[in-house]
């Protein structure tokens, strides 16, 4: 069927349009174009005879039309009057005629719009503003933009006059924004320049800063006032109702108690004619005296005595504060404060209660601290420690033992061997010892101030033979790639060499293995599962040697990425599916299966008898090790083909 397509359909004035002919019949004699919806000789634009390739203008020809051999018509330099219908009349060789009609519309290119306003300085919460988009243009659509966004939904915004007018009722300071209007028709769109709305507002209630209202005599008073306002507010200060100055800041140096009072800031907006005020009450305090601490017991005995610390001087209507070790008082049933907080009582003092203690007197302005006081707590002696820690000695060496016990005042020491008093010294020295020097060595510590004494007994063995050693460990179940393990060879013996073996071999050279403490301690850094071996330590001196029983390290690891077997992924319908999952892990991992994301069972093997294509999908094996806190998984896709069909092929 013969049709006409207008390209474009909407045409801007001055541009061109092509009336494109589709489905032109064969064996043509010629054709004519007419303005309008029918063939009218008075409105012929142009005719064309194919045989002669001759174009003949008609009464409606304007000189802007060009006809093409394919019957299409180009109209140039379009004017408004060109809008409408155009009819093509085709004359075939058999003199049978055919007609088709097309159309297009002509629109003007729009000018750049501008915004006019009925109020350039509206007052907040009082005025309305009407913006109008100029010029008024027929067949144009009007749009509005606020801060380059489309209009927000608001009961205070109203469009009228075919959207050409935007009215803002009851303007607020938040309406201070960039406004643009836009005109659109089918062939063009133009945006105006921005118009900034200048809303007059305020002043709001002023704020006075800083907020503190308490000052110490001799300080400077510097107050600043600010109120939100457009145009900016003018400020005035009043003290106790008396005008001071018209500035935003009020400065009074070296204030005294007489400067206490009410301070008013007034903010004024000359355009809105509004005034707002804020009042703050300033109090100036005189300097308080520096406090000091008195104590009822300067040398209290640990776990026996109580101490009462009092903050001096006593001042009426004053808040007393306390600090221990530069911290506020800890919550403790052994700490008690009097009703007025002036006395701090320490019930049943301990050596940790030495302090320092500070008290403070607080006025509304600041806190004055006392000098620190330290308590001399008498304590101890604690159980003495005898060093060195060796218990085995070889004959012929010197025995030198030292005793220490925590005590205040320092302890007095005595040594006993097998219950017999030896000497009153902190150190015991015996040269060239023999087996006869084996025995029980007792250190007694005495505190003369508290009258308390404590003892420690150590068994010393003097022998050429070394005992059988044993291995102690700081971590019996280390986690792979995370933990370190320190093995220590016991006991500690004097003039002894310590040796280590792993799986019956001497220690391999490795940056992860470190010997310390005279080779008595073997540390494995960042253990791996390969470190789960038998460790043996040995001790030797010039006379004897001995080895410990082996200690096997239990390294927690995994779970590693699981493996699903068999590896096959294609099965025939009717077969049994028997999937086994395995992951290296210590302890053994917990297994669970999911088919197409749906949880199944918690077994290592997943068995499904006589599978069908319904069993197609993803089979996931999940492994979990609570000891290492790690998880892992693997997914396998299973395809089940109908019986008699090769996997991957269809009949």
């Amino acid at each position: 069927k013969l049709t006409i397509e207008s390209t474009p359909f909407n045409v801007a004035e001055g541009k061109e349009v092509l009336l494109l002919v589709h489905n032109l019949p064969q064996h043509l004699f010629g054709y004519s174009w007419y303005k309008g919806e029918r063939v009218d000789g008075n409105r012929q634009i142009i005719g064309y005879v194919i045989g002669t390739q001759q174009a003949t203008p008609g009464p409606a020809y304007s000189g802007r039309e060009i006809i093409y051999p394919n019957a299409s018509l180009l109209i140039q330099n379009i004017i408004q009057n060109d809008t409408g219908f155009y009819t093509l009349h085709v004359i075939k060789s058999d003199l049978v005629n055919e007609e088709a009609t097309g159309q297009f519309r002509v629109y003007p290119e729009l000018p750049k719009p501008s915004i006019s306003s009925n109020n350039s300085k509206p007052v907040e919460d009082k005025d309305a503003v009407a913006f109008t988009c100029e010029p008024e243009t027929q067949d144009a659509t009007y749009l509005w933009w606020v801060n380059n966004q489309s209009l927000p939904v608001s009961p205070r915004l109203q469009l009228s006059n075919g959207n050409r007018t935007l009215t803002l009722f009851n303007v607020t300071r938040n309406d201070t924004a960039s406004y643009k209007c836009e005109t659109q028709n089918p062939v063009s769109a133009r945006r105006s320049d921005s118009v900034i709305l200048n809303v007059l507002y305020g002043p709001d209630a002023p704020t006075i800063s800083p907020l503190n209202t308490s000052y110490r005599s001799g300080e400077n008073l510097n107050l600043s006032c600010h109120a939100a306002s457009n145009p900016p507010a003018q400020y005035s200060w009043f003290v106790n109702g008396t005008f001071q100055q018209s500035t935003q800041e009020l400065f009074i140096p070296n204030i005294t108690v007489n400067n206490s009072g009410s301070y008013t800031c007034q903010a004024h907006n000359s355009d809105t004619g509004l005034n707002r005020t804020t009042v703050t009450t300033i109090t100036v305090y005189a300097e308080p005296p520096k406090p000091f601490i008195t104590s009822n017991n300067s040398n209290p005995v640990e776990d026996e005595d109580a101490v009462a610390l009092t903050c001096e001087p006593e001042i009426q209507n004053t808040t007393y504060l306390w600090w221990v070790n530069n911290q506020s008082l800890p919550v403790s049933p052994r700490l008690q404060l009097s009703n007025d907080n002036r006395t701090l009582t320490l019930l049943s003092v301990t050596r940790n209660d030495v302090g320092p203690y500070e008290c403070g007197i607080q006025n509304e302005l600041s806190v004055d601290h006392s000098d620190p006081v330290i308590l001399n707590v008498l304590y101890g002696p604690d159980d003495p420690t005898i060093s060195p820690s060796y218990t085995y000695y070889r004959p012929g060496v010197n025995l030198s033992l030292s005793c220490h016990a925590a005590s205040n005042p320092p302890a007095q020491y005595s040594w006993l061997i097998d219950g017999n008093i030896q000497q009153h010294t902190q150190e015991l020295f015996i040269s060239n010892i023999t087996e006869k020097n084996s025995g029980l060595y007792t250190c007694q510590a005495n505190n003369s101030a508290s009258g308390h004494s404590r003892t420690t007994v150590k068994t010393i063995t003097v022998s050429a033979e070394l005992p059988k050693p044993s291995i102690s460990s700081n971590n019996s179940k280390p986690v792979e790639d995370k933990d370190a393990v320190a093995f220590t060879c016991e006991p500690e013996a004097q003039n002894t060499t310590y040796l280590w073996w792993v799986n019956g071999q001497s220690l391999p050279v490795s940056p992860r293995l470190q010997l310390s403490n005279g080779n008595r301690t073997l540390t494995l850094f960042n253990v791996t599962r390969n470190d789960a071996r038998a460790y043996v330590c040995g001790i030797q001196n010039s006379v004897s040697a001995n080895r410990s029983d082996p200690v096997t390290l239990d390294v927690l690891y995994g779970p590693d990425t699981p493996i699903i077997s068999p590896p096959d992924s294609s099965y025939l319908s009717g077969a049994n599916l028997n999937l086994s999952c395995h992951s290296a892990s210590n302890p053994s991992p917990q297994y669970s299966w999911r088919i197409n994301g749906i949880p199944q069972q918690h077994t290592q093997v997943l068995f499904i008898a006589k599978i069908t294509p319904n069993n197609n999908g993803t089979y996931a094996c999940f492994v979990s090790n609570l000891a290492t806190g790690r998880n892992n998984s693997i997914v396998k896709s299973i395809t089940v083909s109908a019986s008699g069909t090769s996997p991957g092929l269809s009949a």
């Epitope: 179940k477 302890p587 053994s588 669970s592 069972q601 918690h602 290592q604 609570l626 000891a627």
Partner: antibody, heavy 120, light 107 residues
């Protein structure tokens, strides 16, 4: 649904042996390990050991080592626990129980229990 | 062997009360701990495994917590049907061992 059905109550003399059976149904017998737990009258639960029905591997508590034997018959999906050299303190309800999964899982399904009384 | 110690051995509480039972392992069992409920004359029933995983079908008023050596079973609002003996059990390798049980009664 999963079910573990145990054999009936037994009365035995000291020194004798007892063999308790546990028939499983409602799941694949070889996929889940079977444990045996006992409970003396008015007492708590005591683990005896387990069997892996797939391989026949057993793991017994040290306390019962040498006296207990766990076996299975995969054709009938039945597990057996035999305790020999019985003494009066072996009087208890003996339970078979299925492990929730394999390795380090608890026991989710339990048999109804078999009362074994050892008395002269 | 790992020893499991439960406390208290028995308790009596009112309907609606929050009830807490604790279980301590003699060594680190990480999170491998289960809780069972055994009603008089019945077989034990698994409530919780891996210290905190609730078994399907068990009421949500039961919850478990803890790791390492210290574990807790909590019944947020005790119901008459919760009268039973509760056992903890470690499932960290063999031998499996149970706590001695906690008997829960209604006041």
């Amino acid at each position: 649904q999963v079910q573990l059905v145990q054999s009936g109550a037994e009365v035995k003399k000291p020194g004798a042996s007892v063999k308790v059976s546990c028939k499983a149904s409602g799941y694949i017998f070889t996929s889940y390990w079977l444990h045996w737990v006992r409970q003396a009258p008015g007492q708590g639960l005591e683990w005896i050991g387990y069997i892996n029905p797939n391989t026949g591997y057993t793991n017994y508590s040290q306390k019962f080592q040498g006296r207990v034997t766990m076996t299975r018959d995969t054709s009938t999906s039945t597990a057996y626990m035999e305790l020999s050299s019985l003494r009066s303190e072996d009087t208890a309800v003996y339970y078979c129980a299925r492990e929730y999964g394999n390795y380090n899982y608890p026991l989710d399904y339990w048999g109804q229990g078999t009362l074994v009384t050892v008395s002269s | 062997d790992i020893q499991m110690t439960q406390s208290p051995s028995s308790l009596s509480a009112s309907v609606g009360d929050r009830v807490t039972i604790t279980c301590r392992a003699s060594e680190n069992i990480y999170g491998y701990l289960a809780w069972y409920q055994q009603k008089p004359g019945k077989v034990p029933k698994l409530l919780i495994y891996n210290a905190k995983n609730l078994v399907e079908g068990v009421p949500s008023r039961f919850s478990g917590s803890g790791s390492g050596t210290d574990f807790t079973l909590t019944i947020s609002s005790l119901q008459p049907e919760d009268v039973a003996t509760y056992y903890c059990q470690h499932h960290y390798g063999t031998p499996y061992t149970f706590g001695q049980g906690t008997k829960v009664e209604i006041k």
